[in-house]
């Protein structure tokens, strides 16, 4: 209530002989500042004197004098709120009640604080959680109801007398609420810590032992087991017996059930600490362990790997990759269950042993068509040799092999024949699905791989075919060797280089562009008459009579070909000139007489000249000389001369007789 002074401090303080005590303390006086303070030891109120009796440990008066024996006790407070005290050193007989007698101007107060000083340092107190489980982190607390600035202490944790590695966190409190030193240790106990002694040791600043507290750890844990196997290496052969024993090395609380597991699965009707396996089979190979449970949970032993050894089982072959393309690489894997693992392998291809291939894997770096077939293997270990399994099939795909173009016709092939070709191949995988032909033509393919060329041309030289599956393989081109009659036969003048004049030496050549077969015969013909059988027709001295239409023929075994008719033209000067007279060589005067200069010339006569019997040229230059009317004096011998580009020719004399008419005769 409002008539009380208000104090705050720990109710009791603890210390031991020789240590010190620090008393945190606050107050609030009813009025004014503190004027007098006396610290009593076990004060008692004297009703007679209305004062407190007891040992005065400390006294502060208005004059501020402090007796010399009071140096041990210090008032660290002030005049209005702090009443902290320190006793250093503290003695056993300081135990009891401390009385703080406070006086202000008008008010007085006695505040009591309990001091518990023991003869020796008192032990700290270890606090444990209600339950400790293995591997679960817990905090261990060591609490000591003591702290004093003038007397440093430390708390150390020990496990079975050995300092603990974990770092502890130490805290101190010197407050009006509490005075203590506390050490907290975070710790994950293992099952092996069960029953172990944990100590919290109080030490002075120099590490000297002062006191301690100990607790025995009660670590709850699943059963800890040991498994023993006979034989100890757990390697047996089919038909042998195996015994496994499960031993509980620790359990807290006590175990309740036992079971056995193989490869993680519980074995039925196996609930004792011994597992007997009689006449084991390879299926019983595996990882065995025993499981024992308590209230915390199940505990499992380490696994024992039981190996039941047996000879390899029939093997199977795995192929990477089938189908394989020629030239690619392929890997074969021999798979055979065996224990121990096979040490040697024998490989077979189509039942024949593959030399030098003794590994689990066979790698063929470059596959060939003949590698196709069945691959099998046999595995071998120390217990025996397995059986050869069914094997695996390798399919090797490759382009068509040995492709050939074959001419089906009887030979030789003649121009105009119908030719049939077939495209043949030796082998192919996958099957041939189509064919290609070179060169391309408007030819028919009556069936797959067959080509029909109707009316084969003389110039159809070579044909090649390709057989195609996923790839095309081309055959070497085959020569059709088409036989044909000589082609492009023509007459060619070799000499002379210019026009042919009568008397020249003349050579004509019978040319052709090609012939198959090459062996040929020649024939020269003029007006249906055979002239020669050489490739050339020669005239030592050509005469106009040789002019005309010439043909040459070239013959081979297939047929004969004629050239176009070739006209041989011989140039010559006018010849065989003669003068013809019309109506005759005797003409009656007064009538008309026509003299014609007839000639044979090539080119034709371009210019005529007429001469009389006196070799006088007449002023006439055409082929015909017309005399009209004809006179008697015109009688006489006449001749003509013809001229062309080659030369001149003259006629013999022709006589014209002009006789008198009856009238003239009558007049005479």
């Amino acid at each position: 209530d409002s008539s009380k002074w208000v104090f705050e401090h720990p109710e009791t303080l603890y210390a031991w002989e020789g240590a010190c005590v620090w008393i945190p303390c606050t107050y609030r006086a009813l009025d004014g500042d503190l004027e007098s303070f006396i610290l009593f030891h076990n004060p008692e109120y004297n009703k007679n004197t209305s004062k407190f009796d007891g040992t005065r440990l400390y006294e502060s008066t208005k004059d501020g004098k402090v007796p010399s024996e009071q140096k041990r006790v210090q008032f660290l407070g002030d005049k209005n709120k702090n009443c902290t005290l320190s006793i250093h050193p503290v003695h056993l007989n300081d135990s009891g009640q401390l009385g703080l007698r406070m006086e202000s101007k008008t008010e007085k107060w006695m505040e009591r604080i309990h001091l518990n000083v023991s003869e020796r340092p008192f032990p700290p107190h270890i606090q444990l959680p209600p339950e400790i489980q293995e591997s679960q982190e817990v905090t261990l607390t060591c609490l000591l109801n003591f702290s004093c600035y003038g007397y440093p202490i430390q708390l150390q944790w020990l496990l079975e007398g050995v300092p603990m590695r974990q770092a502890a966190v130490t805290s101190t409190s010197l407050t009006i609420k509490s005075v203590f030193t506390r050490s907290e240790l975070k710790f994950s106990p293992q099952w092996s810590h069960h029953g172990k002694i944990v100590t919290c040791q109080l030490q002075d600043a120099d590490g000297k032992f002062l006191s301690n507290d100990t607790v025995q750890l009660n670590v709850k844990h699943t059963p800890k087991l040991e498994i023993k196997v006979t034989p100890s290496d757990a390697i047996v052969r089919e038909g042998d017996s195996v015994t496994m024993t499960c031993e509980v090395s620790s359990s807290n609380p006590e175990y309740t059930t036992v079971s056995w597991l193989k490869d993680g699965t519980s074995l039925k009707k196996q609930n004792t600490f011994t597992l007997n396996l009689r006449e084991v089979t390879k299926d019983q190979s595996g990882k065995y362990c025993c499981q024992v449970s308590n209230d915390v949970g199940p505990g499992r032993s380490e696994e024992v790997f039981l190996q039941v050894q047996y000879a390899p089982e029939p093997s199977t072959v795995q192929i990477l990759h089938s189908p394989a393309v020629e030239g690619s690489q392929v890997e074969f894997l021999c798979m055979s269950l065996a224990n121990p693992l096979p040490t040697n392998y024998t490989w077979y291809h189509n039942g024949k042993e593959m030399q030098g291939r003794t590994e689990e894997k066979v790698h063929i770096p470059k596959i060939l068509p003949w590698h196709a077939g069945t691959y099998s293997c046999v595995a071998e270990n120390i217990l025996g040799t397995g059986q050869r399994g069914p094997g695996a099939e390798l399919d090797v795909q490759y382009p068509p092999k040995k492709v050939t173009t074959v001419i089906q016709n009887p030979m030789p092939i003649r121009e105009g024949d119908t030719v049939t070709l077939s495209c043949n191949y030796n082998s192919s995988n996958p099957s041939v699905t189509r064919y290609e032909w070179k060169p391309h033509g408007a030819w028919e393919e009556p069936s797959l791989g067959v080509l029909k060329i109707q009316n084969v041309g003389w110039d159809n030289t070579t044909i090649a075919c390709a057989a195609c599956n996923s790839w095309c393989s081309w055959a070497s081109p085959v020569a059709l060797n088409v036989q044909y009659a000589p082609r492009d036969v023509r007459v060619r003048k070799i000499k002379p280089l210019s026009e042919i004049h009568s008397g020249n030496s003349v050579s004509l050549q019978c040319d052709f562009s090609s012939s198959h077969p090459k062996e040929v015969q020649f024939f020269w013909e003029k007006n249906g008459r055979l002239l020669g059988k050489e490739s050339q027709l020669n005239f030592d001295s050509i005469s106009p009579e040789d002019a005309g239409s010439y043909s040459c023929w070239v013959n081979n075994s297939i047929g004969q070909t004629a050239s176009k008719a070739w006209t041989l033209e011989v140039l010559y000067a006018p010849r065989r000139l003669r003068v013809s007279m019309s109506p005759g060589d005797q003409v009656m005067e007064g009538k008309s007489a026509t003299l014609t200069c007839e000639s044979d010339a090539n080119p034709p006569v371009s210019h005529y000249t007429w001469f009389d019997w006196n070799n006088q040229s007449l002023p006439y230059h055409s082929q015909k000389l017309r005399l009209e009317p004809v006179k008697v004096q015109h009688s006489g011998a006449y001749w003509c001369q013809g001229t062309n580009s080659v030369g001149k020719g003259r006629s013999p004399l022709s006589t014209l007789t002009v006789y008198y008419s009856p009238e003239t005769i009558g007049r005479r």
Epitope: G327, W347, H349, M354, Q355, G356, R357, T358, E359, V362, H363, I364, P365, K366, L368, P369, W370, H371
Partner: antibody, heavy 122, light 107 residues
Framework: QVTLRESGPALVKPTQTLTLTCTFS??????????VSWIRQPPGKALEWLAL???????YYSTSLKTRLTISKDTSKNQVVLTMASMDPVDTATYYC??????????????WGQGTMVTVSS | EIVLTQTPSSLSASLGDRVTISCRAS??????LHWYQQKPDQSPKLLIK???QSLSGVPSRFSGSGSGTDFTLTINSLEAEDAATYYC?????????FGPGTKVDIN
């Protein structure tokens, strides 16, 4: 009867390119599974494989020498040619060509040439 | 590449002795190991192929064994003509490699 015969220069100058020819008879390098290799042997030292060419013309080289080697074949002449660039005195050796079979992979060098000694010196 | 190690590098033995030469591979090569004999100034000659297969024309005193990484060439009763250098060779993978050789002398 299968025979192989090596030919080439007996003396090569440093930095020059060596060309060796292996002429064989009794085998055809167009036959599937036929391979020809070059192997060398420095005086008093071990055999060292250099290169291989197979029936397809595919070639393979020694890892340490592959930048300097070229192997080729002329099936019409029944010849395999090896060229080795940047010759050095350490390349002085007897050079052999050998036939290698190929069944389910590479077999052994079953037939060897008589070898040709090549000296590299300036 | 696969490294082949031969032991011993050389040996001397008496006529009629049993001689064994070892070849070890740096990784498993199955049985793809072959043995060659090379006499002075001659080309190598194939003795044993695929680790243990004898060749026609090779005397029966020569035999081979082993697989995986460890191989042995045995000369059952040494003869004077067996003085030579013996090489092992692997054809398991490219690049092909030879052992450093074992020189056999007659005492």
């Amino acid at each position: 009867q299968v025979t192989l015969r090596e030919s080439g220069p007996a003396l090569v100058k440093p930095t020059q390119t060596l060309t060796l020819t292996c002429t064989f008879s009794g085998i055809s390098l167009t036959t599937s599974g036929m391979c020809v290799s070059w192997i060398r042997q420095p005086p008093g030292k071990a055999l060292e494989w250099l290169a291989l060419i197979d029936w397809d013309g595919d070639n393979y080289y020694s890892t340490s020498l592959k930048t300097r080697l070229t192997i080729s074949k002329d099936t019409s002449k029944n010849q395999v040619v090896l060229t080795m660039a940047s010759m050095d005195p350490v390349d002085t050796a007897t050079y052999y060509c050998a036939r290698m079979g190929y069944t389910y992979g590479y077999d052994a060098f079953d037939i060897w040439g008589q070898g040709t000694m090549v000296t590299v010196s300036s | 590449e696969i490294v082949l190690t031969q032991t011993p590098s050389s040996l001397s033995a008496s006529l009629g002795d049993r001689v064994t030469i070892s070849c070890r591979a740096s990784q498993s090569i199955g049985s793809l190991l072959h043995w060659y004999q090379q006499k002075p100034d001659q080309s190598p000659k194939l003795l044993i192929k695929f680790a243990s297969q004898s060749l026609s024309g090779v005397p029966s005193r020569f035999s081979g064994s082993g697989s995986g990484t460890d191989f042995t060439l045995t000369i059952n009763s040494l003869e004077a003509e067996d003085a030579a250098t013996y090489y092992c060779h692997q054809s398991r993978s490219l690049p092909f490699t030879f052992g450093p050789g074992t020189k056999v002398d007659i005492n």
